[in-house]
């Protein structure tokens, strides 16, 4: 599990990773499977009406370390989990929305409160 204070640069994988994609399938995906040199992800966020929406797909290696870190965004409830340990590993990711009012997210420094897993299996 990757802690929030770490800043490990993502390592290039020797082989392509296949991920499930939903609401986030690129043009080169087939049968809701995308391919990447980075990570699989599953994300939950609220839409404009406050309804939780789950999306999943592929994140390219470039910038994925930052995207998988799941830094809280003010006024936006969102959680993302990333994985690389096997093909379609994001089928087993189930991020949950952070609580509505959490002082740690608003006032204090970032603690290790995130639900996400950030696996490094290279």
């Amino acid at each position: 599990k990757k802690e929030d204070g770490e800043s490990t640069a993502p390592t290039a994988r020797p082989k392509v990773l296949r991920c499930k994609c939903h609401h986030h399938c690129p043009e080169d995906s087939v049968n809701n499977i995308c391919s990447t040199d980075g990570y699989c992800f599953t994300m939950i966020e609220e839409d404009d009406s406050g309804t939780p929406v789950v999306t999943s797909g592929c994140l390219g290696l470039e910038g994925s370390d930052f995207q998988c870190r799941d830094t809280p965004i003010p006024h936006q409830r969102r959680s993302i989990e990333c994985c690389t340990e096997r093909n379609e590993c994001n089928k087993d990711l189930h991020p949950t929305l952070p609580p509505l009012k959490d002082r740690d997210f608003v006032d204090g420094p970032i603690h290790h409160k995130h639900h996400h897993h950030h696996h490094h299996h290279h």
Epitope: P14, K15, R18, D28, C58, N87
Partner: antibody, heavy 116, light 112 residues
Framework: QVQLQQPGPEFVKPGASVKLSCKAS????????VQWVKQRPGQGLEWIGE????????LYNQNFKGKATLTVDTSSSTAYMQLSSLTSEDSAVYYC?????????WGQGTTLTVSS | DVVMTQTPLSLPVSLGEQASISCRSS???????????LHWYLQKPGQSPKLLIY???NRFSGVPDRFSGSGSGTDFTLKISRVEAEDLGVYFC?????????FGSGTKLEIK
């Protein structure tokens, strides 16, 4: 050095099945996919499918679903392709190949002849 | 499926001459990661294909620098600056952006 060893020619009768092998050496077997490619004289190269030995995950060309079944034995670093209900159309050279984001090494190929 | 169209089918050249092979794809080969997975292989008679160029323009280890690849999107070229006898054979382009992966029909390089 990276090597993919495939056995010599196979002769089988129509309707039968055959299991082709591909023994990998010179690299970590689970770190790359293994692909299979068909080549018939004058018909170019045709991608059959691929398997990731680290989790047995497979992807197939729709044209070969039901015809080809890909498996691996990680203990011996060997990939297999079973071809079923063989017809003369299946007579070809079958290559296994190492795939990361592109094929960088190929086996020498197994020539399959289907004839009564 | 992505169709890979190679031209010419046959390319007669004199030793020392430059040779150029074209490969066009029916769809863009730019992957969602930003990479372009277009590759070139040489198959000599009775042998398996050998990788020459990967991801459009990267020479594989041990490949002489007289081989170069270029292009983008749907239009790609393999150039051999000075053809040598050992270069004779069939050249294939291949794409691994879209499943199923597909190959060009091949260009046979032969002595004029």
């Amino acid at each position: 050095q990276v090597q993919l060893q495939q056995p010599g020619p196979e002769f089988v009768k129509p309707g039968a099945s055959v299991k082709l092998s591909c023994k990998a050496s010179g690299y970590t077997f689970t770190s790359y996919w293994v692909q299979w490619v068909k080549q018939r004289p004058g018909q170019g190269l045709e991608w059959i499918g691929e398997i990731d030995p680290s989790d047995n995950y497979t992807l197939y060309n729709q044209n070969f679903k039901g015809k080809a079944t890909l498996t691996v034995d990680t203990s011996s670093s060997t990939a297999y392709m079973q071809l079923s209900s063989l017809t003369s159309e299946d007579s070809a050279v079958y290559y296994c190949a190492r795939f990361g984001f592109y094929v960088d090494y190929w086996g020498q190929g197994t020539t399959l002849t289907v004839s009564s | 499926d992505v169709v890979m169209t190679q031209t010419p089918l046959s390319l007669p050249v004199s030793l020392g001459e430059q040779a150029s092979i074209s490969c066009r794809s029916s769809q863009s080969l730019v992957h969602s990661t930003g990479n372009t997975y277009l590759h070139w292989y040489l198959q000599k008679p009775g042998q398996s294909p050998k990788l020459l160029i990967y991801k459009v323009s990267n020479r594989f280890s041990g490949v002489p620098d007289r081989f170069s690849g270029s292009g983008s999107g749907t239009d790609f070229t393999l150039k051999i600056s000075r053809v040598e006898a050992e270069d004779l054979g069939v050249y294939f382009c291949s794409q691994s952006t879209h499943v199923p992966f597909t190959f060009g029909s091949g260009t046979k390089l032969e002595i004029k």
